[in-house]
Interface confidence: medium
C-alpha cells in the first residue's frame, strides 16, 4: 500500500531565530508540479495559499509554530514538520560563562552557564555554525550545559538565550559570544 502524498519541508531563511524588526522568509517545498500550497500559523486563523511567506520585519505576534501542506488534484499531502519561529531580542541578553574557564584541555570537562536577572525558566545554547541548539528542547529548563570529555569539535563560539515557558517563542537577545578554546589537540 502506498502512503498519502509525502509531506513537504518548511524552512525559515536565513534562520528560525529572528531578531525583532528583521526580515525572514518561510518557504514550503513540495515535489514539482504542486497545484496549491497552504502555509499557516498554528493556533491562529492566519494562513495563506502560497508556498512563500516573506516577513519584512519580525513582530512578537508572528512568533509561533508554522506548518504547511500542499494539494495535488483533490488530495492533500501530509503536513510538514512544525517550524518554530522565534522572535529574539524581546528581552535583555543573558550572560554566558564557562566553568572552570573558557580554555579547556582535550578530554577535560567544562560547563557553560547561562545567567539572567529575570525569572526565566528556559535556556537555549547555540554554537556558531550549528543550526540546532546544543541541547534538546526538553532539557532547556537547565541553565547549565555540561560538556563531558571535550574534543576539538567543541571549539568554537557559543551564545545563549533565555526565555519563559509561558511564552516559548519570545526570546531574549543573544548573550555576548563566548569563545571555547580546546588545548592539547
Amino acid at each position: 500500500q502506498s502512503g498519502p502524498l509525502p509531506k513537504p519541508s518548511l524552512q525559515a531563511l536565513p534562520s528560525s531565530l529572528v531578531p525583532l524588526e528583521k526580515p525572514v522568509t518561510l518557504r514550503c517545498q513540495g515535489p514539482p508540479g504542486v497545484d496549491l500550497y497552504r502555509l499557516e500559523k498554528l493556533s491562529s486563523s492566519r494562513y495563506q495559499d502560497q508556498a512563500v511567506l516573506f516577513i519584512p520585519a519580525m513582530k512578537r505576534s508572528l512568533a509561533g509554530r508554522y506548518r504547511c501542506s500542499y494539494q495535488n488534484g483533490s488530495l492533500w499531502s501530509l503536513p510538514s514538520d512544525q517550524l518554530e519561529l522565534v522572535a529574539t531580542g524581546v528581552f535583555a541578553k543573558p550572560s554566558l560563562s564557562a566553568q572552570p574557564g573558557p580554555a579547556v584541555s582535550s578530554g577535560g570537562d567544562v560547563t557553560l552557564q547561562c545567567q539572567t536577572r529575570y525569572g526565566f525558566d528556559q535556556f537555549a545554547l547555540y554554537k556558531e555554525g550549528d543550526p540546532a541548539p546544543y541541547k534538546n528542547p526538553e532539557r532547556w529548563y537547565r541553565a547549565s550545559f555540561p560538556i563531558i570529555t571535550v574534543t576539538a569539535a567543541h571549539s568554537g563560539t557559543y551564545r545563549c538565550y533565555s526565555f519563559s515557558s509561558r511564552d516559548p517563542y519570545l526570546w531574549s537577545a543573544p548573550s555576548d559570544p563566548l569563545e571555547l578554546v580546546v588545548t592539547g589537540t
Epitope: G3, K7, P79, D81, P137
Partner: antibody, heavy 114, light 106 residues
Framework: QVQLQESGPGLVAPSQSLSITCTVS????????VNWVRQPPSRGLEWLGM???????DYQSTLKSRLSISKDNSKSQVFLKMNSLTTDDTARYYC????????WGQGTSVTVSS | DIQMTQSPSSLSASVGGRVTITCKAS??????IAWYQHKPGKGPSLLIH???TLQPGVPSRFSGSGSGRDYSFSISNLQPEDIATYYC????????FGGGTKLEIK
C-alpha cells in the same frame, strides 16, 4: 515497506517505570516523527506524545511530568519511558508514524500489577 | 488542550446501509482531522486525513467532511468487514482522539 514493532516488559509493578522500544523499518527517523498511543482495557485510544524528526518532543499535558520519549536514529529505534506507574497505566501501547499516524505497530500489552 | 467529542458511542446498521459519525472539537481545528478504523488485535488503520482525503487503498464508500469545529465521517454501502471501532483524531494542536464509535451490523 513501512513497519513498526513495539517491544515491552509485559508486566510492571506499581510505582516502577515502564520502558518500551519501537523499532521501525522502511523510513528514516531523521525525517519522520513517531507517536506513542495507548488503549486501556475496554477504553478508547489515548495519545501520549511524539518525537519529531529533529528530536524535539511533544507530550500530552496530563502525562508530561512522568513521560519521556527519545530515539536512536542509527538503530531506527524510538523509546518510551513512563515513571511512577499505577494500575491505570495498564494498556496496550502502540507506536505510529508521524502525523497523522499513517502506519502503526501491532502494539504491546502492559499490565501494571503487584 | 483540544477536546474531541465523538458521537454516537455505538451504532448498529444493516449491510448495504449508511452510517454517519460526528466529532466536535472544542476549538477550530482548521480541517486537521483524521479518521481511523480499529479492529481487535490490530493496530488502527488510517482511513482519511485532512478532513476528506482518502488514504490510498481505502474504498470510496468511506468519506469525510466538515470545517471549523464540526466534522463528520460516513460509510455508505455498509459491508460485514466494516465491523470495528472508529475514532476521530485532531492534529491541529498536539493530538487528541475522540472517544470512539463501535459499529455493529444488524
Amino acid at each position: 515497506q513501512v513497519q513498526l514493532q513495539e517491544s515491552g516488559p509485559g508486566l510492571v509493578a506499581p510505582s516502577q517505570s515502564l520502558s518500551i522500544t519501537c523499532t521501525v523499518s522502511g523510513f528514516s527517523l531523521t525525517y519522520y516523527g513517531v507517536n506513542w498511543v495507548r488503549q486501556p482495557p475496554s477504553r478508547g485510544l489515548e495519545w501520549l506524545g511524539m518525537i519529531w524528526g529533529d528530536g524535539s518532543t511533544d507530550y500530552q499535558s496530563t502525562l508530561k511530568s512522568r513521560l519521556s520519549i527519545s530515539k536512536d536514529n542509527s538503530k531506527s529505534q524510538v523509546f518510551l519511558k513512563m515513571n511512577s506507574l499505577t494500575t491505570d497505566d495498564t494498556a496496550r501501547y502502540y507506536c505510529a508514524r508521524d502525523l497523522p499516524m499513517d502506519y502503526w505497530g501491532q502494539g504491546t500489552s502492559v499490565t501494571v500489577s503487584s | 488542550d483540544i477536546q474531541m467529542t465523538q458521537s454516537p458511542s455505538s451504532l448498529s446498521a444493516s449491510v448495504g446501509g449508511r452510517v454517519t459519525i460526528t466529532c466536535k472539537a472544542s476549538q477550530d481545528i482548521n480541517k486537521y482531522i483524521a479518521w481511523y478504523q480499529h479492529k481487535p488485535g490490530k493496530g488502527p488503520s488510517l482511513l482519511i486525513h485532512y478532513t476528506s482525503t482518502l488514504q490510498p487503498g481505502v474504498p470510496s464508500r468511506f468519506s469525510g467532511s466538515g470545517s471549523g469545529r464540526d466534522y463528520s465521517f460516513s460509510i455508505s454501502n455498509l459491508q460485514p468487514e466494516d465491523i470495528a471501532t472508529y475514532y476521530c483524531l485532531q492534529y491541529a494542536l498536539l493530538l487528541t482522539f475522540g472517544g470512539g464509535t463501535k459499529l455493529e451490523i444488524k
